[in-house]
């Protein structure tokens, strides 16, 4: 037996960070975003509850809501009308899926001060908003929408045909909401509120996936939820607009289905106002390589809305999928026919280009091997995006201002240079027409939120700079983080590798791969993080690496689409790759690797356990997925193609984890995964385990009864990363 | 609270023209559908018109199309009714009501006497 | 058009009866899209239901809707003297909207 090895920081009055510290979120920094409310004006929820109202221009603030009134019906949001006359209060958040929770909500009028009574609003509701003017009210409600015209209104019922597990009206169902939307609404205002926009999910033949919730009673409840994963049947989906003005005088309006996407299984993908009679829908092949944005007007005199041919925009891949995790949006120019749109330009870049009229003609606003990411705002003469560009570090983001009033258009990084050390990760929120905005800087340093004039870019005030977590972080033992990058053959990696305090080269230290891997992710970031690692590599002495191996986003297409349709094997030589260099740097201690990962990570750290390579000594997969079968159809194929015999069925079934069981062997293996998981379905642990034991391979597993994908309750994320640190150490032999 | 007080009912002749108004108080008049309704003397009710709150659509029941419009000033909160060609069959207590989404109506104002006779 | 046909055309109750009344559409009335409204003699109509079943504010619950499709119905539990009165069904499921003809509940 190896003689345990304890790693002690040498000589430093500051301490090292222990796991209660990780736990109880101790070192958890804040961001500060402005809710908008005009061009200068906003609200904030201070510390004690208070809604606050400010005026950059006037410098005045003051609170519109007070902590007692969002006291009285225990309010843990708010939503302030635009007409400024009525608050929604949102209490008894009560959490579904991913996005999508219920809750109860009450109206409280600012003008009376007083909550508004009479046609109260019913619960749980699923969704509500306000419209974009004035104060009127949509809502969901058991699958249906309903409107208010205003809130002490008696309501509208718009939709008839919602049912549990069935019709979904105005919100997403469960593959929806996580694969395609990624909100928990499915129902868009238009600009002036004259119109709402829904869709209707229709589950009714998705195949049911059931688990068991164990709860405390004598018996467990069983949750149904309509979940299609590859090859299965998929929702129908349809898109509705109601004028909600005189709704009844047509009743809601469908708006069709481009032609070369309703010829064969399709999805919807985004809808975008354009203006008060211009919708733009977005719509996708069931092989997620064709995209279609389509352009569409309402026809009073047919109380109707159009959507020509020649407003049809097709974006198709040739290489892999359309679009990056999501196919992007466009951001609408003030003329509402012209727009900007982020696709992958020639080079396999995804870059800005503005389309006037058609996608063929497209005019390339950004370009070079790097990616813009997000276009934040189109104004009358700015655009305003973030890419990867600065340095050449694919893992940062800067906001950059595109002066589109001039010709030729002139590109000016209005984060660059503004705390160049401590800042590298940028995300803005934009006041209605970018006359301000604020920037929330997430590292490397300590996050801080600025507030800027969106003319001059000149930084009014600072709104959060973590002062406090400054503070106390003064006597800590932080690890030192480095992001660098490795050469194999023609291949570059990025990696970030998490070193102990005192790090010394000629020294051999234990070294954790935190892995995630999935097609369109990026885990080499320049933000700050005191987690779970952190504390491995201060308390532990253990060293950490993060690498972006093929597959991973904002790289180029040629790095991106290489794991398409074959999904399990780069993403793992990758991993494998980056180990044998990290060893080749001579201070890691090659008889103790580990690898871990969550969710596509444990899929990765899973099969890079199995790859019988011996590089690893031990891991840990939590919720892994162990076959693309099991998983949602919209992800699944989006990477891997249908899993049929005449597609791609043959890699489907050599890229699970069972078929590797035996390469378990020699590895510890330590299996985690929650019991209610509505994501990544237990299913897929149940079928690792069930094969290692019919391989007779001895391996570690701990379930989590009633948690989901995120095992987060309190007592369960604890007792999850205490498990883990045991395992770890024990496997390092490293002494508790 | 909500009223609706009509005015510029009367006696007028055949073919004659008249002007209603319905003044409204105490809700947000311009964020509602409103509409005219009426009702001939011993008999039930009949939908005349409705207008959108900008004032921008317009809505009339077939046996007023053509000689009535409906209109609004949101800025001194007033509905109108602008009937022209007046027939005897007109002859009806018109109703100024609220209109919920193009459906139900909710107050009435307390109506308006319009006697077409020569 | 819609036509609503009211019956009985009179009911005749005495205070603290059950009174129910019916109203029946030539074509289906599509979601429920039915009101009903009180009016007593000299006065403007009041709304009582809206949406088959649905009370508007300030309605005693001794007054329920039912119905769907072309047959619909209003309950008055127990007749309280302020009930007698002229009722009309109305519906907004298509255009124009139309009104039944009246039923008028009188002291027996």
């Known amino acids: 037996l190896r003689p345990s090895r304890v790693y002690k920081p040498e000589g430093n009055t500051k301490r090292a960070l222990t796991l209660k510290d990780i736990l109880n979120g101790t070192f958890s920094y804040k961001t500060y975003f402005p809710n908008w409310i005009s061009e200068q004006e906003y609200l904030h929820q201070s510390e004690d509850d208070n809604i606050v109202f400010y005026n950059i221009e006037t410098r005045e603030s003051y609170i519109i809501l007070s902590n007692s009134t969002m006291k009285s019906v225990n309010a843990t949001d708010y939503g302030l009308s635009p007409d400024r006359q009525f608050v929604y209060l949102e209490s008894d958040y009560s959490k579904l899926w991913r996005y999508s929770y219920t809750a109860t909500y009450y109206i409280y009028d600012l003008q009376n001060g007083e909550f508004v009574r009479g046609y109260e609003l019913p619960r749980p509701i699923q969704y509500l908003c306000w419209s974009p003017v004035g104060s009127k009210l949509a809502y969901v409600y058991q699958n249906n929408i309903y409107l208010k015209q205003r809130p002490g209104d008696p309501p509208f019922q718009i939709t008839y045909t919602g049912r549990e597990n069935r019709i979904f009206n105005g919100i997403p169902d469960w593959v929806y909401e996580e694969e395609m939307l990624a909100t928990k609404y499915a129902l868009w205002w238009s600009p002036d509120g004259k119109f709402l926009a829904y869709v209707e999910f229709n589950d009714s033949d998705i195949p049911i996936i059931a688990y068991s919730y164990y709860g405390d009673g004598q018996y467990p409840r069983t949750i149904n939820i309509p979940y299609p994963k590859a090859g299965a049947k998929n929702p129908v989906v349809r898109v509705f607009i109601v004028d909600t003005t005189y709704p009844h005088h047509v009743g809601p309006m469908e708006v069709p289905v481009p032609e070369m996407i309703a010829s064969s299984d399709y999805y919807f993908s985004w809808l975008t106002w354009v203006s008060s009679e211009r919708v733009c829908l977005q719509w996708l092949k069931r092989v997620q390589n064709v995209s279609v944005l389509s352009i569409c007007d309402f026809r009073e005199d047919w109380h109707a809305w159009e959507c020509p041919k020649n407003q049809e925009h097709v974006e198709e891949s040739r290489t892999g999928w359309a679009g990056g995790f999501f196919v992007s949006t466009p951001a609408f120019s003030q003329d509402a026919t012209s727009y900007y749109k982020i696709f992958s330009d020639k080079d396999g870049y995804k870059h800005i280009h503005y389309i006037k009229d058609t996608v063929e003609n497209a005019i390339q606003i950004t370009s070079g091997k790097w990616e813009a990411i997000y276009i934040f705002r189109v104004t009358q003469d700015s655009l305003f995006y973030s890419s990867n560009e600065f340095e050449g570090y694919p893992g940062r983001r800067n906001i950059y201002r595109i002066s589109i009033g001039n010709s030729p258009p002139s590109k000016k990084c209005v984060t660059c240079h503004l705390r160049k050390e401590r800042c590298q990760y940028y995300t803005a929120s934009f006041s209605y027409k970018a006359k301000y905005y604020a920037l929330v800087c997430y590292g490397p340093g300590l996050p801080i939120s600025t507030l800027h004039d969106g003319r001059t870019d000149q930084e009014i005030q600072v709104l959060e700079e973590n002062k406090e977590l400054e503070n106390s972080l003064r006597n800590i033992q932080l690890p030192k983080v480095e992001i660098k990058k490795l050469k194999d053959g023609g291949l570059t990696f990025w990696y970030k590798m998490i070193l102990p305090p005192q790090f010394d080269r000629s020294k051999k230290y234990p070294l954790l791969i935190q892995v995630y891997g999935g097609p369109c992710s990026q885990s080499v970031k320049s933000v700050f993080a005191v987690n779970w690692i952190t504390y491995l590599a201060s308390k532990e002495g253990i060293v950490i690496a993060l690498v972006d191996g093929r597959g991973t986003a904002f790289q180029g297409d040629k790095f991106l689409h290489a794991v398409y349709r074959k999904l399990g094997v780069y993403e793992v030589e990758d991993q494998l790759t980056a180990v044998r260099k990290f060893i080749e740097m001579g201070f890691i201690d090659e008889e103790r690797i580990a690898i871990w990962g969550w969710s596509y990570g444990g899929y990765v750290s899973s099969l890079a356990l199995a790859s019988g390579t011996g590089l690893f000594k031990c891991g840990i997969a939590v919720a892994p997925v162990s076959s693309w079968e099991y998983y949602a159809s919209i992800y699944s194929e989006r990477f891997m193609g249908l899993p049929t015999k005449d597609d791609n069925l043959e890699h489907y079934k050599n890229s699970t984890v069972m078929a590797r069981a035996e390469y378990f062997r020699n590895v510890d293996y330590l299996l985690i995964h929650g019991t209610a998981d509505d994501n990544v379905h237990f299913q897929n642990s149940a079928q690792i385990a069930k094969a290692l034991v019919n391989a007779q391979v001895d391996f570690q597993a701990m379930w989590y009864s009633d948690q989901n994908h995120g095992i987060s309750s309190g007592r369960s994320q604890n007792h999850l990363y205490t498990h883990m640190t045991h395992f770890l150490k024990q496997c390092f032999s490293l002494s508790d | 609270e909500v009223q609706l007080l009509e005015s510029g009912g009367g006696l007028v002749q055949p073919g004659g023209s008249l002007r209603l108004s319905c003044a409204a108080s105490?809700?947000?008049?311009?964020?509602?559908?409103m509409s005219w309704v009426r009702q001939a003397p011993g008999k039930g009710l009949e939908w005349v018109s409705a207008i959108v709150p900008s004032g921008g659509d317009t809505y009339y029941a077939d046996s007023v199309k053509g000689r009535f419009t409906i209109s609004r000033d949101n800025s001194k909160n007033t509905l109108y009714l602008q009937m022209n060609s007046l027939r005897a069959e007109d002859t009806a207590v018109y109703y100024c009501a609220k209109d919920y989404y193009g459906g139900w109506f909710d107050p009435w104002g307390q109506g308006t006497l319009v006697t077409v006779s020569s | 058009e819609i036509v609503l046909t009211q019956s009985p055309g009179t009911l005749s109750l005495s205070p603290g009866e059950r009174a129910t009344l019916s109203c029946r559409a030539s074509q289906s009335v599509s979601s429920s899209y039915l009101a009903w409204y009180q009016q007593k003699p000299g006065q403007a109509p009041r709304l009582l239901i809206y949406g088959a079943s649905s009370r508007a504010t300030g309605i005693p619950d001794r007054f329920s809707g039912s119905g769907s499709g072309t047959d619909f119905t209003l309950t008055i539990s127990r007749l309280e003297p302020e009930d007698f009165a002229v009722y009309y069904c109305q519906q907004y499921g298509s255009s124009p909207r139309t009104f039944g003809q009246g039923t008028k509940v009188e002291i027996k």
């Open positions: 105490g809700f947000t008049f311009k964020s509602y559908v």
